[in-house]
């Protein structure tokens, strides 16, 4: 005879256990039904009546078949450094995991209790163990023949470029600078290229910054030697550089004199307005292989007649160290221009948000038929000291930081050559001195 199916509640056979989804109630001494996930026991069973279940209230849950008198409370809302990967429902608890760039320093049964920012390796150190959801980055010094010039939680040390003739040997935090007798790129007259310390990590491609209306522009800014961008194969020899530099300086002086004369004549100018916008990029997006259209600053030897644009740009450089500039010992910069005190020998201390620097440089090149014009070239910067995400940086607030007395029209730069192609070209990365090169 087939055994009869017992309906709850029922008394179990001596020595046997209750069936699946049933529990033994000690008071009633009967096998009773459990409540399904999302429910709890409102009334416990008796010898004659089964368990009465009720749905969990808001912000409470039960994940398993149960006979608990009250549902469990969902965990507190996810903190700002976390992402809610599973919402609180009647059947499951909220799960918080660390957002990108952070790792779980203290885990709980499900999700994470405490997130911490991934360590950033400072220049001279590279990632030797990438961070994971549950482990921090490990930084190690760059081996001989390799370098890292970034403060990053993803960049590994990279080999120095190979030079035919080395101008400046590379070290752990700087690539080698090459020199050669014949230039491998066409140069604008009156200026010498020194490649800039732009990170050229192969494994990261830089997103295209917001398009700019600027044609390829050659600013003349004084700066010291620095490591090259990838693909830079050679520069002018020193004597040629000096000659060209002196020539440029002469032209600059003539231009300034012209300016003084022109300011006397009050004629309305026809101005070509050129804007070079340097968008703020998230820290780990602001690096990558430099495309052919990306621009490098042209340089002249520093002189007493350097314009206010030069000095303000230099001041900006000093004010806002970037990931591509080697930092002073104990201080590390992250991509958004933040500086942190270093707590370790081989890596940076974790830190939050820092100062974001948005630089907008506007140069008005003025021209009128009789060469007499009066206008001011303006370079303005938008700077925000925020703890918010990059997207919340103050875009619209424009704080002028310098005004040119007059922008002269050089023979080297006619309106036609300035306008060049009207197509919009991406500018590089938020690095004040990453510069421009002729396209």
């Amino acid at each position: 005879l087939p055994a009869q199916v017992a309906f709850t509640p029922y008394a179990p056979e001596p020595g046997s256990t209750c069936r699946l989804r049933e529990y033994y109630d000690q008071t009633a001494q009967m096998c009773c039904s459990k409540c399904s996930p999302g429910q709890h026991a409102k009334v416990f069973c008796t010898k004659t009546s089964d368990t009465v279940c009720d749905s969990c209230e808001d912000s409470t849950y039960t994940q398993l078949w149960n006979w608990v008198p009250e549902c469990l409370s969902c965990g507190s809302r996810c903190s700002s450094d976390q992402v809610e990967t599973q919402a609180c429902t009647r059947e499951q608890n909220r799960i918080c995991t660390c957002r990108p760039g952070w790792y779980c320093a203290l885990s709980k049964q499900e999700g994470c209790r405490l997130c911490a920012p991934l360590r950033k390796c400072r220049p001279g150190f590279g990632v030797a163990r990438p961070g994971t959801e549950t482990s921090d980055v490990v930084c190690k010094p760059c081996a001989p023949g390799t370098f890292s010039n970034t403060t990053s939680s993803t960049d590994i040390c990279r080999p120095h470029q190979i030079c035919n003739v080395v101008a400046i040997p590379g070290n752990a935090s700087m690539d080698a600078v090459c020199t050669s007798t014949s230039p491998t790129r066409s140069m604008a007259p009156g200026a010498v290229h020194l490649p800039q310390p732009v990170s050229t990590r192969s494994q990261h491609t830089q997103p295209t910054p917001e398009p700019s209306t600027a044609p390829s522009t050659s600013f003349l800014l004084p700066m010291g030697p620095s490591p090259p961008a990838e693909g830079s194969t050679g520069d002018f020899a020193l004597p040629v550089g000096l000659i060209v530099g002196v020539t440029a300086l002469g032209l600059l002086i003539i231009g300034v004199v012209n300016c003084v004369i022109m300011t006397q004549v009050k004629k309305k100018p026809l101005c070509l307005q050129r804007e070079a916008k340097v968008p703020h990029l998230p820290a780990d997006k602001a690096r990558g292989t430099q495309g052919p259209e990306q621009q490098h600053l042209l340089i002249t030897a520093p002189s007493s007649s350097s314009s206010s644009l030069e000095s303000s740009a230099s001041a900006l450089d000093r004010r806002a160290p970037t990931r591509n500039q080697p930092q002073a010992p104990g201080v590390e910069a992250s991509g958004a221009g933040e500086a942190r005190a270093s707590t370790g020998s081989s890596d940076s201390s974790p830190g939050g948000h820092g100062t974001q620097v948005n630089v907008t440089c506007i140069v008005n090149v003025c021209s009128s038929s009789d060469h007499s014009s009066q206008c001011s070239s303006q370079a303005s910067s938008t700077m925000g000291d925020t703890d918010s995400s990059p997207s919340e940086s103050p875009k619209d607030e424009q704080v002028p930081f310098s005004k040119e007395e007059c922008a002269f029209r050089s023979q080297l730069e006619t309106p036609e050559t300035l306008l060049g192609s009207t197509e919009e070209k991406p500018l590089p990365l938020g690095v004040p001195d990453a510069g421009m090169k002729p396209s």
Epitope: V127, S135, K140, C142, I156, C157, Q203
Partner: antibody, heavy 118, light 110 residues
Framework: EVQLVQSGAEVKKPGATVKISCKVS????????IHWVQQAPGKGLEWMGR????????EYAPNFQDRVTITADTSTDTAYMELSSLRSEDTAVYYC???????????WGQGTTVTVSS | EAVVTQSPATLSLSPGERATLSCRSS?????????ANWVQQKPGQAFRGLIG???DRAPGIPARFSGSGSGTDTTLTISSLQPEDFAVYYC?????????FGGGTKLEIK
């Protein structure tokens, strides 16, 4: 000059444990991870694991996880690889190395032959 | 567990020819997080790391060696084979917390 010098060949019985040493010189041991790689006769390379001598933290390949222990002694500039529960398929040459796809610090020991035979 | 497959197992070419060695990840696309590497082994000689970070030549490695990656594959190219390039080449991919080597490609003289 950077050198990694490994201990000599070993012959072991199945079920036994072998411990190979790797003495480094010419650089600061804590600056780079030390890896252990297995190469069975006529076979390719099998990454076993690595140790960070700075803090002793290790990472192991899933296939070796249960049987391998990699350590480093900074006082003697020596790394060790211990493989337990040996079986015949563990017969191989074992290399210690500072090779790392992250650092380009590329030095290898001369290899230690371990023969597992009953 | 991740499996890294190299192809071909053997490649027979003559000096001066171009060699293309492929390495495929079983777990989907090879990303920058796999930090793809290539290692050379010559009989009776120490191993030598050639490429790191998918396409960076290690210090001292000739320019004829280059690495690239797209989709599930990472590739080692030797533009013009020299007699000393005939060896076994291994690729290695990083998976979260461990390296996995491919089975190797033997590059032999035709």
């Amino acid at each position: 000059e950077v050198q990694l010098v490994q201990s000599g060949a070993e012959v072991k019985k199945p079920g036994a444990t072998v411990k190979i040493s790797c003495k480094v010189s010419g650089y600061t041991i804590t600056d780079f991870y030390i890896h252990w790689v297995q190469q069975a006769p006529g076979k390719g390379l099998e990454w076993m694991g690595r140790v960070d001598p700075e803090d002793g933290n290790t990472e192991y390949a899933p296939n070796f996880q249960d049987r391998v222990t990699i350590t480093a002694d900074t006082s003697t500039d020596t790394a060790y690889m211990e493989l337990s529960s040996l079986r015949s398929e563990d017969t191989a040459v074992y290399y210690c190395s500072t090779w790392d796809g992250f650092s380009y610090f590329d030095y290898w020991g001369q290899g230690t032959t371990v023969t597992v035979s009953s | 567990e991740a499996v890294v497959t190299q192809s071909p197992a053997t490649l027979s070419l003559s000096p001066g020819e171009r060699a293309t060695l492929s390495c495929r990840s079983s777990t989907g696309p090879v990303t920058t997080n796999n930090y793809a590497n290539w290692v050379q082994q010559k009989p009776g000689q120490a191993f030598r790391g050639l490429i790191g970070g998918t396409n960076d030549r290690a210090p001292g490695i000739p320019a004829r060696f280059s690495g690239s990656g797209s989709g599930t594959d990472t590739t080692l190219t030797i533009s013009s084979l020299q007699p000393e390039d005939f060896a076994v080449y291994y690729c290695a991919l990083w998976y979260r917390n461990h390296w996995v080597f491919g089975g190797g490609t033997k590059l032999e003289i035709k």
